[in-house]
């Protein structure tokens, strides 16, 4: 529209004006995990906490059993950290046994699932290397970016070891998405 | 507004459309922090560039006092990066004592101070162990979410040591905030 | 214009209103990188995947020569992951040595390139040492920030050593920006 | 006001200890590394080592290792600096030094003279 | 441990002169690179941190450049308070190491 006189019924046609305090948008927060059956050969997804404290849905954005449900179709800004925590990790008990460092590992991979595809798609992926020296060790990894989805699709986060997410506080562990 | 006539004295009354350029937003750049009081029991907090180099505050979002101030009401994506930099870590030589390795560590904390509220709200947190080998260690913590905000709330980054923070260029620390 | 009626013809004189869907934007993905002459004295640049899988680039956003050319002024958000791999430091080998531990280190630059400056600008930096003890290693770095951009700006991702990236998967190195 | 007051002139026999203080003012003592620098009459600047005034974590110059002993007390915003088994060539002006980051010194006391003599 | 060497060891010069002092590490220090100046019976000030940044209250005829291994201090036009004894010192890695000194005399 640059330099173009405002002209609503010529611009509706290809790409309607938004306010932009209705588009979908959430912020999920951590709640402590409960055991429950997982996909097999899939990380195990983590549910969240959607409207208590800082988290909040809007705008026909809906979380439901662990997905956050894309209610419109558009370029969506995705992004997630998942805090870790952990008591020594294997790689320093490998390393004292004298046998090779095969390092422990931490994901956070962020998942569309689309109903028509029969294979969910990974749309973020950290993964790090835990060879810690100390007894006790803790750190985010954090994911963000920006991608087209569809109407329909749903998204989720799936961590490498769901009993190491540090559940303790919402500004910790949090995922969200919201319509560019 | 999908599929629905361009309305806009009906849309005017929950959601006015607004012109991007004309949001609220800031990026703010590290500055060497100067020794000063800190709040008691919380984290020190960080003073920031705002109008230098890539640093900068536009329509209504003002920096002064370590806060950034907000001036709108609405959804607004927040972010920070602090990188750290030490010479050894304590873990180290606690561990050269054979006591057990309680880690060093460092957090970053992006905090929102609302008046009417006694106490400030964490909004998003990272937090990881340090218990490195080598003498010289550095390493970012990056943060970012989106938060609905209320006019007159105000922002700032609070660090668990504020002594380890790099100083050194615009590009490694950062904090910043915009209207979506 | 909070509180104010909606006034096009006054909006339109200071900032037109756009359609969302009609911004520049774009979201790369990792390819192997092929050795390639990189400039003197500074990182080596990455190269992308701009259309294939997960990536695109749309609404003038174009991406030529390892660049992402920058169609209009405006306020951008820029982000990138890179994701490192390594066998052992040459830190844990200093140091069985006895030798003074100099880390090693991972870095990413993301940079600015305006053909009327001389020289680049560094807009985002994200630097680790790395001392790990396992032998295997891999981690990601993550950046993301608001930046002012002119027409014809271009946007690139430096790495400190391009044969420690991370080519297998395009969740897992990324680079993206978007008009706000 | 920022400061530090370090405690005044000390003449020590060779062998014997000495121990310097640093009161802090006008900042948050604990969110700022203290350093101890000493400076030998007409000489350059020597580092000895920092504490960590929040956790009571120390870094001492190898040169010190064994001979120094930083310490703090939080109630008082106090640092202190104790070197044993003094030896001639540690007469000297004993600064405590802080500053906003980790490896530059804003701020420096007055400077303790410590005299080791027979 | 990084050894700093500083030239001049002394130097003469006269008010209203432009002096160089220039400070080389011996391994890259990046740009943790300090600058002070002593006074006869007075504490170090701090100059120029991170080897180009002006410390807060120092007058601007004071600079500083430099990145890696070698840095020079500038100043632009010597005032009488200016004479006194300048001292480079690394914050890159422990210990912190200071260079020689730099003493500046009246011509």
């Known amino acids: 529209l640059k330099g173009q006189e405002f002209a609503p019924s010529h611009q509706q046609v290809y790409a309607p004006l938004r306010a932009d305090g209705d588009k979908p948008r959430a912020h999920l927060t951590v709640v402590r995990q409960t055991p429950t059956q997982h996909f097999k050969n899939q990380f195990p997804a983590l549910h969240w906490e959607h409207e208590l404290g800082l988290a909040f849905t809007k705008n026909r954005m809906n979380y439901t059993n662990k997905f956050l449900l894309i209610p419109e179709s558009g370029d969506y800004f995705i992004y997630s950290q998942v805090t870790f925590r952990g008591m020594t990790s294997e790689c320093s008990e490998i390393r004292q046994a004298g046998r090779p460092n095969k390092p422990d590992s931490i994901t956070v991979v962020i998942t569309k699932v689309t109903d028509s595809y029969p294979e969910p798609t990974q749309l973020l992926m950290g993964t790090k290397s835990v060879c810690e020296v100390g007894s006790n060790w803790f750190q985010p990894i954090y994911l963000g970016a920006m991608f087209s989805l569809q109407e329909g699709d749903k998204l989720m986060v799936n961590v490498s070891d769901i009993s190491l997410v540090d559940y303790t506080k919402e500004d910790k562990t949090f995922f969200g998405a919201f319509l560019l | 507004l999908k599929g629905q006539e361009f309305a806009p004295s009906h849309q005017q009354v929950y959601a006015p459309l607004r012109a991007d350029g004309d949001k609220p937003r800031a990026h703010l750049t590290v500055v060497r922090q100067t020794p000063t009081q800190h709040f008691k029991n919380q984290f020190p907090a960080l003073h920031w560039e705002h109008e230098l180099g890539l640093a900068f505050t536009k329509n209504r979002m003002n920096y002064t006092n370590k806060f950034l101030l907000i001036p709108e009401s609405g959804d607004y994506f927040i972010y920070s990066q602090v990188t750290f930099r030490g010479m050894t870590s304590e873990c180290s030589e606690i561990r050269q004592a054979g006591r057990p390795n309680k880690p060093d560590s460092i957090t970053v904390v992006i905090t929102k101070v609302t008046d009417s509220y006694p106490e400030p709200t964490q909004l998003l947190m990272g937090t990881k162990s340090v218990c490195e080998v080598g003498s010289n260690w550095f390493q970012p913590i990056y943060l970012g979410a989106m938060f609905s905000l209320q006019e007159g709330d105000k922002l700032m980054v609070n660090v668990s040591d504020i002594s380890l923070v790099d100083y050194t260029k615009e590009d490694k620390t950062f904090f910043g905030a915009f209207l979506l | 214009l909070k509180g104010q009626e909606f006034a096009p013809s006054h909006q339109q004189v200071y900032a037109p209103l756009r359609a969302d869907g009609d911004k520049p934007r774009a979201h790369l993905t990792v390819v192997r990188q092929t050795p390639t002459q990189h400039f003197k004295n500074q990182f080596p640049a990455l190269h992308w995947e701009h259309e294939l899988g997960l990536a695109f680039t749309k609404n003038r956003m174009n991406y030529t020569n390892k660049f992402l050319l920058i169609p209009e002024s405006g306020d951008y958000f820029i982000y990138s992951q890179v994701t490192f791999r390594g066998m052992t430091s040459e830190c844990s080998e200093i140091r069985q040595a006895g030798r003074p531990n100099k880390p090693d280190s991972i870095t990413v630059v993301i940079t600015k390139v305006t053909d009327s400056y001389p020289e680049p600008t560094q807009l985002l930096m994200g630097t680790k040492s790395v001392c790990e003890v396992g032998s295997n290693w891999f981690q990601p770095i993550y950046l993301g920030a608001m930046f002012s951009l002119q027409e014809g700006d271009k946007l690139m991702v430096n790495v400190s050593d391009i044969s420690l990236v991370d080519y297998t998967k395009e969740d897992k190195t990324f680079f993206g920006a978007f008009l706000l | 006001e920022v400061q530090l007051v370090e405690s005044g002139a000390e003449v020590k026999k060779p062998g014997a200890s000495v121990k310097v203080s640093c009161k802090a003012s006008?900042?948050?003592?604990?969110?700022?590394?203290m350093h101890w620098v000493r400076q030998a009459p007409g000489q350059g600047l020597e580092w000895m080592g920092w504490?960590?005034?929040?956790?009571?974590?120390?870094n001492y110059a190898q040169k010190f290792q064994g001979r120094v002993t930083m310490t703090r007390d939080t109630s008082i915003n106090t640092a202190y600096m104790e070197l044993s088994r003094l030896r001639s060539d540690d007469t000297a002006v004993y600064y405590c030094?802080?500053?906003?980051?980790?490896?530059?010194?804003?701020?420096w006391g007055q400077g303790t003279m410590v005299t080791v003599s027979s | 441990d990084i050894v700093m060497t500083q030239s001049p060891s002394s130097l003469s010069a006269s008010v209203g002169d432009r002096v160089t002092i220039t400070c080389r590490a011996s391994?890259?220090?990046?740009?943790?690179l300090n600058w002070y100046q002593q006074k006869p019976g007075k504490a170090p000030k701090l100059l120029i941190y991170?080897?180009?940044r002006l410390q807060s209250g120092v007058p601007s005829r004071f600079s500083g450049s430099g990145s890696g291994t070698d840095f020079t201090l500038t100043i632009s036009s010597l005032q009488p308070e200016d004479f006194a004894t300048y001292y480079c010192?690394?914050?890159?890695?422990?210990?912190?190491?200071f260079g020689p000194g730099t003493k500046l005399e009246i011509k």
């Open positions: 030094a802080s500053g906003g980051s980790i490896d530059a010194f804003d701020i």
């Open positions: 006008g900042y948050t003592f604990t969110a700022y590394y």
């Open positions: 504490i960590n005034p929040n956790s009571g974590g120390t």
């Open positions: 391994q890259s220090i990046s740009s943790y």
């Open positions: 991170g080897a180009s």
């Open positions: 010192q690394q914050g890159f890695s422990t210990p912190f190491t």
